[in-house]
């Protein structure tokens, strides 16, 4: 049976918490990704940004989980209007910002 949206969001948050807590060396060797506007469509935008990071096992589960939240197919190189123009940040900072935002969504009961 499908996982309730609140459970799915909680599991995604748990995964991001694990990543931030277990981070020893620079996450994904310090790879840079496009910063996004943390507004509507955050899951697809986050996936569109993170999908361009390859060979980083630490975020593979996050990529798969985000894929479950995003209703359309996302492929590398694709980018929506939610990208912050010409701004790149380290994956570690991206994950931290995303985590803060998702925790707020959970606190506010916004699961979809």
């Amino acid at each position: 049976s499908p996982v309730p949206p609140s459970t799915a969001l909680k599991e995604l948050i748990e995964e991001l918490v694990n990543i931030t807590q277990n981070q020893k060396a620079p996450l994904c060797n310090g790879s840079m990704v496009w910063s996004i506007n943390l507004t509507a469509g955050v899951y697809c935008a986050a996936l569109e940004s993170l999908i361009n990071v390859s060979g980083c096992s630490a975020i593979e589960k996050t990529q798969r989980m985000l894929n479950g939240f995003c209703p359309h197919k996302v492929s590398a190189g694709q980018f929506s209007s939610l990208r912050v123009r010409d701004t790149k940040i380290e994956v570690a900072q991206f994950v931290k910002d995303l985590l803060v935002h998702l925790k707020k969504l959970f606190r506010e009961g916004q699961f979809n």
């Epitope: 948050i13 507004t39 707020k104 959970f106």
Partner: antibody, heavy 125, light 112 residues
Framework: QVQLVQSGAEVKKPGSSVKVSCKAS????????MHWVRQAPGQGLEWMGT????????KYVPKFQGRVTITADESTSTAYMELSSLRSEDTAVYYC??????????????????WGQGTLVTVSS | DVLMTQSPSSLSASVGDRVTITCRSS???????????LEWYQQKPGKAPKLLIY???DRFSGVPSRFSGSGSGTDFTLTISSLQPEDFATYYC?????????FGQGTKLEIK
């Protein structure tokens, strides 16, 4: 260290407006919710509303809707509470407070873990 | 609005006593995300309130272990196992589950 420093005491005439500021340091306000709570002399605490400084979204107590405006300026790490059409029963100490996520738990947003020192607003003709 | 009713409104006790303050909500305060955002605050005259307990029973960092919270649904309790001189203050329960968030009317704890 975490600090919330509020603006000084104000004396206002009925019908006027007051704007109280709350300067944050030691954390990023965009990671938090910022709240405003008031306490009339000898009375209990009353939650007025909150803002998410990351996007400007606000929630207000219906009783204050239309009279209160909560804003935040991320660039100066300052939250503001403006109350208009003041009446004598608005005489109170106004507190700002923050709630922030806990790195070590999945979903904990503390209700209000750090508070400003309070700002006394006196409404008198 | 959710009405939070504390009892008693005032209480006289001695150092070393075990004290229980109760808080009843006018409706169930389980949030849509499954958490119950019930907190307890302590306030001393002329000072800002201090967070003691969040999510019914989680003690905030630095709060002595003599403070504990319990309850579920609509009935909640704050217990001070052995009163210390610095514990004489006013205590407020608070619900952050349903907007508008609301405080109880307070319980003033005085020295007998």
């Amino acid at each position: 260290q975490v600090q919330l420093v509020q603006s000084g005491a104000e004396v206002k005439k009925p019908g006027s407006s007051v704007k109280v500021s709350c300067k944050a340091s030691g954390f990023y306000i965009k990671d938090t919710y910022m709240h405003w709570v008031r306490q009339a002399p000898g009375q209990g605490l009353e939650w007025m509303g909150t803002i998410d400084p990351a996007n400007g979204n606000t929630k207000y107590v219906p009783k204050f809707q239309g009279r209160v405006t909560i804003t935040a300026d991320e660039s100066t790490s300052t939250a503001y509470m403006e109350l208009s059409s003041l009446r004598s029963e608005d005489t109170a100490v106004y507190y700002c407070a923050r709630s922030i996520y806990d790195d070590y738990h999945v979903d904990d947003y503390y209700a209000m873990d750090y508070w400003g020192q309070g700002t006394l607003v006196t409404v008198s003709s | 609005d959710v009405l939070m009713t504390q009892s008693p409104s005032s209480l006289s006790a001695s150092v070393g006593d075990r004290v229980t303050i109760t808080c009843r909500s006018s409706q169930n305060i389980v949030h849509i995300n499954g958490n119950t955002y019930l907190e307890w605050y302590q306030q001393k005259p002329g000072k800002a309130p201090k967070l003691l307990i969040y999510k019914i029973s989680d003690r905030f960092s630095g709060v002595p272990s003599r403070f504990s919270g319990s309850g579920s649904g609509t009935d909640f309790t704050l217990t001070i196992s052995s009163l210390q001189p610095e514990d004489f203050a006013t205590y407020y329960c608070f619900q952050g589950s349903h907007v508008p968030w609301t405080f109880g009317q307070g319980t003033k704890l005085e020295i007998k």
